[in-house]
C-alpha cells in the first residue's frame, strides 16, 4: 500500500471503559493530530476506516460492524460499542484516506471489569473541593453524546458502595452531586450510574471520581517560615558542620507553585564557591496544606562562612517572604593562666 502518515500508538490516550457498558470513542486524529475536523474531511471526499489489533496479537484486522444488534458501529468520527465486551481490549486504529492522502493513528482501548462496589483498575479523575466553603458540586463526567436531550436518564449516586440518599451534607441533583458543606469525611470515591433507554434496551454508564477535600482559599495565607527564626542561633566553630533547616508552611492553593530557596550573601548556592548541599523534604496535611523543609548543610564551615548572610525565601501565589538565619562563630572560652612569680632576685 502507498505511504501513510502514521502517528503511531497514541499512549497518551489510554482509554479505559467498563465491560458491558456503552462506549463512544472519537478518532483522535481530528482532536490532536490534524488541523481539520471530520466534517471538512468527509466533504473533501476522505473516508475514515477503523481496524484493530487484539490484545497479545500482532495481526491487524478489520472491525466487524455486522454483529448482532449492531454491537459495534461507526457514526461519523465515533466508534460505538453497545455494549463493550472484555475481549474488545486491544489497539484500535483510525485511518483517514483517499487516493492521494492517508493519515492514521492507533490508540489502546482497555475494557475493565468492576465489582459490585465499583472497584476496578480504572484510573480515577480527582475532584478537589474546598473545606467548609459553601455549596460545591461534582458533575457526572463523560456522559455527553450517549443519549439525546429528549431522553431523561435516571442517575444514582454512590459514595463507595452506598447509595447517596440520606447523607447529611450531600444532595444528589441529577447529574450533579451538591455538597452543602465539604468536610474531610467527604473524601472518597463517588460513582454516578446513569441509566437510559435506547431502542428497547436499557444501558448503564458508570463513572467514578475521587473527591479530595482541600484547604479553602478563604483560609489561605502567604507562606509562613517557621525556621529559621529569631529564637535559634546557629553558633559553630570553624571545622564543624553547619546545618540550617528552612521550614515553610504553605496553605493549599489550587494550581499554586510553592517554592523555597536559600540565598547566601544574596546569591543562590549554585552561584557561589562554598561546598554547600541542600536537601528538601515535603509533607502534606489532610487538606493538602504543604510543609517544605530545605536543609542547608556545609560540612566543614570556615570562619568566613560564619560571617555570611543565610536567608531562607519562600513564595506562593499568596506572596513572598524571607527570613535570615542567625549564624555566628563560637567565641572560644577564655583560658585562665596563673603566672607564679617566684625567685625574685635580691641582691
Amino acid at each position: 500500500s502507498e505511504r501513510c502518515d502514521d502517528w503511531g500508538l497514541d499512549t497518551m490516550r489510554q482509554i479505559q471503559v467498563f465491560e458491558d457498558e456503552p462506549a463512544r470513542i472519537k478518532c483522535p486524529l481530528f482532536e490532536h493530530f490534524l488541523k481539520f475536523n471530520y466534517s471538512t474531511a468527509h466533504s473533501a471526499g476522505l473516508t475514515l476506516i477503523w481496524y484493530w489489533t487484539r490484545q497479545d496479537r500482532d495481526l491487524e484486522e478489520p472491525i466487524n460492524f455486522r454483529l448482532p444488534e449492531n454491537r459495534i458501529s461507526k457514526e461519523k468520527d465515533v466508534l460505538w460499542f453497545r455494549p463493550t465486551l472484555l475481549n474488545d481490549t486491544g489497539n484500535y486504529t483510525c485511518m483517514l484516506r483517499n487516493t492521494t492522502y492517508c493519515s492514521k493513528v492507533a490508540f489502546p482501548l482497555e475494557v475493565v471489569q468492576k465489582d459490585s462496589c465499583f472497584n476496578s483498575p480504572m484510573k480515577l479523575p480527582v475532584h478537589k473541593l474546598y473545606i467548609e466553603y459553601g455549596i460545591q458540586r461534582i458533575t457526572c463526567p463523560n456522559v455527553d453524546g450517549y443519549f439525546p436531550s429528549s431522553v431523561k436518564p435516571t442517575i444514582t449516586w454512590y459514595m463507595g458502595c452506598y447509595k447517596i440518599q440520606n447523607f447529611n451534607n450531600v444532595i444528589p441533583e441529577g447529574m450533579n452531586l451538591s455538597f452543602l458543606i465539604a468536610l474531610i469525611s467527604n473524601n472518597g470515591n463517588y460513582t454516578c450510574v446513569v441509566t437510559y433507554p435506547e431502542n428497547g434496551r436499557t444501558f448503564h454508564l458508570t463513572r467514578t471520581l475521587t473527591v479530595k477535600v482541600v484547604g479553602s482559599p478563604k483560609n489561605a495565607v502567604p507562606p509562613v517560615i517557621h525556621s529559621p527564626n529569631d529564637h535559634v542561633v546557629y553558633e559553630k566553630e570553624p571545622g564543624e558542620e553547619l546545618l540550617i533547616p528552612c521550614t515553610v508552611y504553605f496553605s493549599f492553593l489550587m494550581d499554586s507553585r510553592n517554592e523555597v530557596w536559600w540565598t547566601i550573601d544574596g546569591k543562590k548556592p549554585d552561584d557561589i564557591t562554598i561546598d554547600v548541599t541542600i536537601n528538601e523534604s515535603i509533607s502534606h496535611s489532610r487538606t493538602e496544606d504543604e510543609t517544605r523543609t530545605q536543609i542547608l548543610s556545609i560540612k566543614k564551615v570556615t570562619s568566613e562562612d560564619l560571617k555570611r548572610s543565610y536567608v531562607c525565601h519562600a513564595r506562593s501565589a499568596k506572596g513572598e517572604v524571607a527570613k535570615a538565619a542567625k549564624v555566628k562563630q563560637k567565641v572560644p572560652a577564655p583560658r585562665y593562666t596563673v603566672e607564679l612569680a617566684c625567685g625574685f632576685g635580691a641582691t
Epitope: 473545606i131 467548609e132 459553601g134 455549596i135 460545591q136 458540586r137 440518599q165 440520606n166 447523607f167 447529611n168 451534607n169 450531600v170 444532595i171 444528589p172 441533583e173 441529577g174 451538591s178 452543602l180 458543606i181 468536610l183
Partner: antibody
Amino acid sequence: QEQLVESGGGLVQPEGSLTLTCTASGFSFSSNYWMCWVRQAPGKGLEWIACIYTGGSGVTYYASWAKGRFTLSKTSSTTVTLQVTSLTAADTATYFCARDLVVVTSFNLWGQGTLVTVSS
Amino acid sequence: ALMMTQTPSPVSAAVGGTVTINCQASEDIYSNLAWYQQKPGQPPKLLIYSASTLASGVPSRFSGSGSGTEFTLTISGVQSDDAATYYCLGVCTDISVDDVYNSFGGGTEVVVK
C-alpha cells in the same frame, strides 16, 4: 431519649427583638446534624426559616425572606439560638426546632414548639 | 426561589380507601422531597424522605413516588388515625448564589369518614 425543647417565646412588642433557644437532650452536636427552625402561623402551613450545620464552622442557610432579620447560631454542644429582630405581627407563630439527620428535608426529631405573639 | 404547590385540599376518604396527594415543585428537585404528617397541637412527623423512602416506624400503607417536579403521597387502606394535615417539603441548591432552598407545600387536610 432524644428530645428538643424550644424556649424564649412569649409576647413581644412590634419592632422588638427576641432570642429563641433550642436545647437538645439525649444527644449532643458532637455528631454532625442540621439543626433547623420552622414556624407555623396560627391556622396556617409550615414555613422553613433556617438550618445550621453543627459540625465544622457551622455553615448556615436561610430562607430568602429570613435573611437579615434572623440569625441562627450554635451556642453550645447542646443549644442553638435563633435571634429575630424588627418583629411584626406577621411573625406571630409557633416556632419549632427540628433536627435533620439526613440533609435538610428529613426532620426526624422535632420540639413541641414555642409560641411567639407580636402585639402591642 | 423554590415553590411547592400541593393539591387537593381538603381531601376526604372512607376507612379502608385510598388517598392520593400531589405535590408540584416549581423547578426540578430530582428526588429531594419529604412528606410530613401533622395533627392539631403537635409538631410534624416525618413519613417519607428522598421522595420514596419510608422513615423509620412509619406504616407501610404510606408510600411516596415521583421525581423531578411531580410527586405523590399515597395512603392505601386509610385508617381513622390518618386524619391529619400532610405537607411536602422540597429542597434544591443554587450554586451561583451559594444557597439552599427549602420549601413546604401549603398542606393537604385529610378527612377520614
